[in-house]
């Protein structure tokens, strides 16, 4: 059990107060983390509270400002990037968000040697992506879907690609679906380790169907937003990977990297690129039916300045029980011999673990094992491998950092974080300097987050980087809810849940219950992390019990649970939420006449299906930006879990798993449906179709749209949204305002 103390003592009860909705909307109790911007083994940059860019040297203990807030302010810079030779800094301003990761900006180059902005051959605007080479101060950037190269910031640019065209051809940046569902980045170009070569992807969206929606703005006529967006079964982008020698780009142009024959024989995806050395690169490819992935190691052939990918250096990863990988196929971490690598994939027992591949995947040496999962490989040095897992004390919702000494035999394992601040910190991530000389640990909870700096050899804590003292003080007079993480065993399935309980929780009383659900494949909601958010307020002030349940399809508990939903989304996720609710009722403190469910995105889909399950368990519920039919969602994501919506594949379940098919079942529940009209991700179409089906079935429901808002419903919409949902729930639970 993880209990977050409510710090309520009888003598202090008068000074303590409950959380308010205003606290949540104002971000009063938000926390800070500290991720060093490493620039060497022992140095990092950090933007100070007053916006100076400061360089810290851990070994000398010295720090000095490399860029003043005055210079930052002169161009309204909101971000910066130091060139590896430390001669220049790019300053980023005019940030303009596009999709989840992508944005455009204006870039200025500041010369640190003379304290002036570089004049002449200035960068065009707005730029879609810009980055320094890993060595020196070459610049690669993407402008109007084409890639440009500068040998030095003041030089004229060299244009690498010429075919870039809005919504048609994307060079060096992903199209919508690759950004959201495959790469999870705003860029699609990669420098080789010493900056000799630049690899990039070209995405051809010419044949992709376009989603079009109105953006109302302030004009007399709305604008139409057009995005090439492949829905399930539709034509997909065509991807090609090229590499160019940046030293002599005018001599030999971009050389295409060949696609493995077994991948190229049908529709496929490129999933990631990892440079090994300046003359060796590793590409990962995936069949459109995403249960076969191929890792291909390619070498530079000097005689023709081309890239050769021998079949002997192709490694196949295949899943027979689900899709390849977890959410994404894992990426390799190469060892110092520049050919063998470490990678996370399923072992014979169906748990994701670290394997060492020297020649073939069949001969892989398993490095970790057990009924838990390795989650991320952070760094491999010559003698250590650092990774995270949820092994400790068998809580899947924890993350601890481990070190395996690979330099000695047999390799020994040490948990770096398990006992550091055991009550406060059970969910960590890490950030390593060059050669893992030093590292930062960022603890996310369950207590107040804390960031610390450590020696990479001894693991000794050197200093606290951020401990959120102000937050700790601000919370001293707040009645926080109690939180517990436990598990239910039902029909050989383990359902982990987090329960958030009112501060003066009394097991002999009855409380309204709100289920918060996400439930998407390879997600995890039950995590040992700190949060003061809307549901904290609902428990603290409104006296609700809130529960989050990780059912079938969720991650980090083995393939049996993960792949249970393969090809049948919308069945077991819903069943498991319902099962958990029944178990919660059996605990005796839930008012079974006041049970609600809510979720966003995939959670909106699950909450809608749960409300329409016909169980009579739920009095009311909310779906925010829900998927309503898998035929409406993106190909890359949907087909990974559902296959294709064709008669000879899985069309039947595509049709059976829609929210619209269950319209009649909403008759006996109070349903609040919410969506942004400019949602580029889960299109407004999804909610429009639910509403149409409910109207056609003559079922009453409530709805709210947010004009010109995307999938995040940000800004003032957030305040309106949570206020609206609060009123809805209080009304449903007969709680006075």
């Amino acid at each position: 059990i993880v209990l977050r103390p409510s710090r309520v003592h009888n003598s202090e009860e008068n000074t303590m107060r409950a959380l308010t909705l205003k606290d949540i909307l104002n971000g009063t109790f938000s926390y800070k983390t500290f991720f060093p911007n490493w620039i060497s083994g022992q140095e990092y940059l950090h933007q100070s509270a007053d916006n100076n860019i400061v360089l810290y040297n851990i070994e000398t203990g010295q720090s000095y400002t490399i860029l003043s807030n005055r210079t930052m302010k002169s161009v309204n810079a909101s971000n910066y990037g130091l060139s590896p030779d430390r001669q220049f800094v790019y300053l980023e301003s005019d940030y303009s968000k596009l999709w989840r990761y992508s944005y455009t900006a204006t870039y200025y180059i500041y010369d640190l040697s003379n304290g002036e902005f570089v004049r002449g051959n200035e960068l065009p605007r707005p730029i879609q992506y810009l980055c320094w080479s890993p060595v020196g101060s070459k610049l690669a950037y993407v402008y109007q879907n084409n890639i440009y190269l500068k040998q030095r910031p003041g030089d004229p640019p060299f244009q690498i690609t010429f075919n870039g065209r809005e919504n048609k051809i994307f060079n060096g940046i992903p199209d919508w679906v690759y950004e959201e569902e495959m790469l999870a980045t705003k860029y699609a170009l990669w420098w080789s380790p010493n900056g000799k070569f630049l690899a990039y992807a070209e995405f051809n969206d010419t044949d992709i169907p376009v989603i079009a929606y109105s953006y109302y703005g302030d004009e007399q006529y709305p604008r139409t937003i057009n995005i090439p967006y492949p829905k399930a079964g539709a034509k997909n982008p065509v991807v090609r990977i090229f590499i160019i020698d940046t030293t002599y780009p005018a001599y030999v142009g971009p050389q295409e990297v060949p696609v493995p024959a077994m991948i190229a024989s049908s529709d496929y995806y490129f999933s990631w690129l990892t440079w090994v050395t300046d003359e060796r690169v590793c590409l990962q490819w995936l069949k459109r039916v995403q249960n076969v992935s191929v890792l291909s190691i390619c070498d530079f052939r000097e005689d023709w300045q081309t890239w050769d990918c021998p079949k002997t250096q192709e490694h196949i990863e295949e899943s027979r029980t689900g899709w390849a990988g977890g959410f994404f196929v894992s990426t390799p971490v190469f060892s110092y011999d520049a050919i063998s690598y470490y990678k996370i994939f399923s072992d014979k027992d169906g748990y994701k673990h670290i394997h060492y591949i020297k020649d073939t995947v069949e001969n892989a040496i398993q490095i970790t094992s057990g009924k838990w999962e390795a989650i991320n490989i952070f760094r491999v040095t010559q003698d250590s491998l650092f990774y995270s897992s949820n092994e400790f004390e068998e809580y899947p919702g924890r993350r601890n950092i481990y070190r395996i000494s690979i330099g000695s035999y047999p390799p020994s394992k040490k948990c770096v974080t398990c006992h550091l601040r055991k009550e406060r910190c059970q969910y960590y991530t890490a950030s390593f300097s060059d050669y893992a000389k030093y590292y930062a640990l960022v603890c996310y909870g369950p207590g107040i987050p804390i960031s610390t700096l450590h020696d990479g050899r001894t693991d000794q804590e050197i200093k606290i980087l951020e401990e959120n003292k102000e937050l700790e003080n601000a919370l001293k007079n707040i009645q926080l809810p109690k939180e517990e993480i436990k598990k239910l065993e039902v029909d050989e399935i383990t359902l982990w849940y987090k329960m958030i309980l009112p501060p003066q929780f009394d097991r002999s009383k009855k409380y309204p219950l709100l289920i918060q659900v996400y439930g998407g494949p390879c997600s995890q909601s039950v995590r040992s992390v700190f949060a003061v958010n809307w549901i904290s307020y609902l428990a603290s002030k409104e006296g609700m019990v809130i529960a989050l349940v990780d059912g079938r399809g969720t991650a980090f508990q083995g393939d049996k649970l993960l792949y249970a939903v393969y090809r049948k989304l919308g069945v077991y996720e819903v069943e498991d939420q319902i099962t958990a609710v029944r178990k919660f009722i059996e605990m005796g403190f839930i008012d079974e006449k006041r049970i609600a469910i809510w979720g966003w995105s995939y959670g909106g889909y699950v909450s809608s299906l749960a409300l329409a399950s016909g169980t009579g368990l739920f009095k009311c519920g909310i779906a925010v930006a829900p998927v309503s039919s898998w035929e409406y969602y993106a190909s890359v994501y949907t087909e990974r879990f559902m296959g294709l919506p064709t008669k000879d594949d899985n069309l039947e379940h595509y049709k059976n798993s829609t929210v619209m098919a269950r319209a009649e079942y909403f008759r006996n529940v109070d349903y609040l449906l919410i969506h942004g009209t400019a949602d580029d991700n889960v299109h407004f179409q999804n909610s429009a179709q639910i509403a149409k089906a409910l109207v056609n079935a003559q079922v009453d429901f409530q709805a709210m749209w947010y004009s010109d808002q995307n999938h995040g419903l940000s800004g003032l919409s957030t305040n309106h949204l949570y206020t609206h949902m609060t009123h809805f729930l209080k009304q449903c639970f007969s709680l006075s305002d």
């Epitope: 010429f162 030293t247 002599y248 005018a250 001599y251 030999v252 142009g253 971009p254 000097e302 023709w304």
Partner: nanobody
Framework: EVQLVESGGGLVQPGGSLRLSCAAS????????MGWFRQAPGKGRELVAS????????YYPDSVEGRFTISRDNAKRMVYLQMNSLRAEDTAVYYC???????????WGQGTQVTVSS
């Protein structure tokens, strides 16, 4: 792996013109810089024109600037050298080649003889 075959050479009077052609087979050469070299009797090979893969970047030494024009047709896998206002000193064997930076590879054609004489 790749073959380069030059044609179009011959005997021409001073002030006359010739168009040399280079046909490439095997590897696609659209992403390589192509060039024309010449070698006069008893002398080394000298670059007379190059055209980059970008298609727009051409290079000529001062000795031929304004008289020679290099062009390429990637679809047909051809590289051309238009030579105008020919002089006696242009007499040489002309070779088509793939040009690599700072490296010399023997990706040459067999050459075509150009003789400028009255």
């Amino acid at each position: 792996e790749v073959q380069l075959v030059e044609s179009g050479g011959g005997l021409v009077q001073p002030g006359g013109s010739l168009r040399l052609s280079c046909a490439a087979s095997g590897r696609t050469l659209s992403s390589y810089t192509m060039g024309w070299f010449r070698q006069a009797p008893g002398k080394g090979r000298e670059l007379v024109a190059s055209i980059s893969w970008v298609d727009s970047i051409t290079y000529y030494p001062d000795s031929v600037e304004g008289r020679f024009t290099i062009s390429r047709d990637n679809a047909k896998r051809m590289v051309y050298l238009q030579m105008n206002s020919l002089r006696a000193e242009d007499t040489a064997v002309y070779y088509c080649a793939v040009i690599f930076p700072e490296q010399v590879y023997d990706y040459w054609g067999q050459g075509t003889q150009v003789t400028v004489s009255s």
